[in-house]
Interface confidence: low
Amino acid sequence: KESCDVQLYIKRQSEHSILAGDPFELECPVKYCANRPHVTWCKLNGTTCVKLEDRQTSWKEEKNISFFILHFEPVLPNDNGSYRCSANFQSNLIESHSTTLYVTDVKSASERPSKDEMASRPWLLYR
């Protein structure tokens, strides 16, 4: 019989290389049975994991698994670092392995995106 415990399927030592200025969705795969757990994201700062309170998140439901998504709109250079999702379920706290974002800053802060880039990647404008 399949376990009805909540499980978080972030692989150990998983990592993503992403570009500053691009949009990005960091997925926390969540398996649950009847009631969807309360899931949060945090960012590691040394040995503590700082809860990300004012960030855009959403759920994506699929047939056999759900994803709790942390949105980067767009990715900023200081988004570099390790993240963890955790679920509260029946008074238990379940924590995922950490996943690391390696952010490449494609432009120095003083450079503005070109008109071509703004047309093809309007999120570079933030608006």
Epitope: R55, Q56, E73, P74, L76, W123, Y126, R127
Partner: antibody, heavy 120, light 112 residues
Framework: QVQLRESGPGLVAPSQSLSITCTVS????????VSWVRQPPGKGLEWLGV???????NYHSVVISRLTINKDNSKSQVFLKLNSLQTDDTATYYC??????????????WGQGTSVTVSS | DIVMSQSPSSLAVSIGEQVTMSCKSS????????????LAWYQQRPGQSPKLLIY???TRESGVPDRFTGSGSGTDFTLTISSVQAEDLAVYYC????????FGGGTRLEIK
């Protein structure tokens, strides 16, 4: 210049489906998102959903089970399909060009709207 | 969903007067990452489609007269029209895009 034009059936019977086409010009559907917003008679605006340049969609939780938005980039057309209509779906339906990213965006150009009445 | 509340629901002013209207959100619309408030204001004149006036709470859309000013941060926002003109007769809606968009109920501006 940027233009959007909605075309719909006008009258739809309860429990039937509503299909509206938004034909755009002056910008590429590969690059920009298009949102659908409706306005019941004498009431306020309600965002329904969006299709982005890459084809991804987001839907309002109230209509997610009944709404499908897709598009044909080559024809510069965006399509709304809303199933199982009830009388409270009677509204003017607008399409609007979206500028920005998935969360931080504004609707900077709007169509003139198409009026839809749900009645037998 | 984030709930947007606008007040008053309607108000009447004379030409040339200043008017302010309020918009409150059920949670903060300020992103600590981008330091922007994801709030926009739209104007809908009678029988017309909505028109974007303000985004990021205070940035005027191009072509919008400078008598329109948006202000506020976090959960409390204000749209001010410094000297009302006859063509400002409209309903004004605020909209958050911090999460999937929701509109306020609107403020109807009437001319005395």
């Amino acid at each position: 210049q940027v233009q959007l034009r909605e075309s719909g059936p006008g009258l739809v019977a309860p429990s039937q489906s509503l299909s509206i086409t938004c034909t755009v010009s002056g910008f590429s559907l590969n690059t920009y998102g298009v949102s659908w917003v409706r306005q019941p008679p004498g009431k306020g605006l309600e965002w329904l959903g969006v299709v982005w340049g890459d084809g991804n969609t987001n839907y309002h939780s109230v209509v997610i089970s009944r709404l499908t938005i897709n598009k044909d980039n080559s024809k510069s057309q965006v399509f709304l399909k809303l199933n199982s209509l009830q009388t409270d779906d009677t509204a003017t339906y607008y399409c609007a060009k979206c500028y920005g990213s998935r969360f931080d965006y504004a609707m900077d150009y709007w169509g003139q709207g198409t009026s839809v009445t749900v009645s037998s | 969903d984030i709930v947007m509340s606008q007040s008053p629901s309607s108000l009447a002013v004379s030409i040339g007067e200043q008017v302010t209207m309020s918009c409150k959100s059920s949670q903060s619309l300020l992103s600590s990452r981008t330091r922007k408030n994801y709030l926009a204001w739209y104007q809908q004149r009678p029988g017309q489609s909505p028109k974007l006036l303000i985004y990021w709470a205070s940035t005027r859309e191009s072509g919008v007269p400078d008598r329109f000013t948006g202000s506020g941060s976090g959960t409390d926002f204000t749209l001010t029209i410094s000297s009302v003109q006859a063509e400002d007769l409209a309903v004004y809606y605020c909209k958050q895009s911090y999460n999937l968009p929701t509109f306020g109920g609107g403020t109807r501006l009437e001319i005395k």
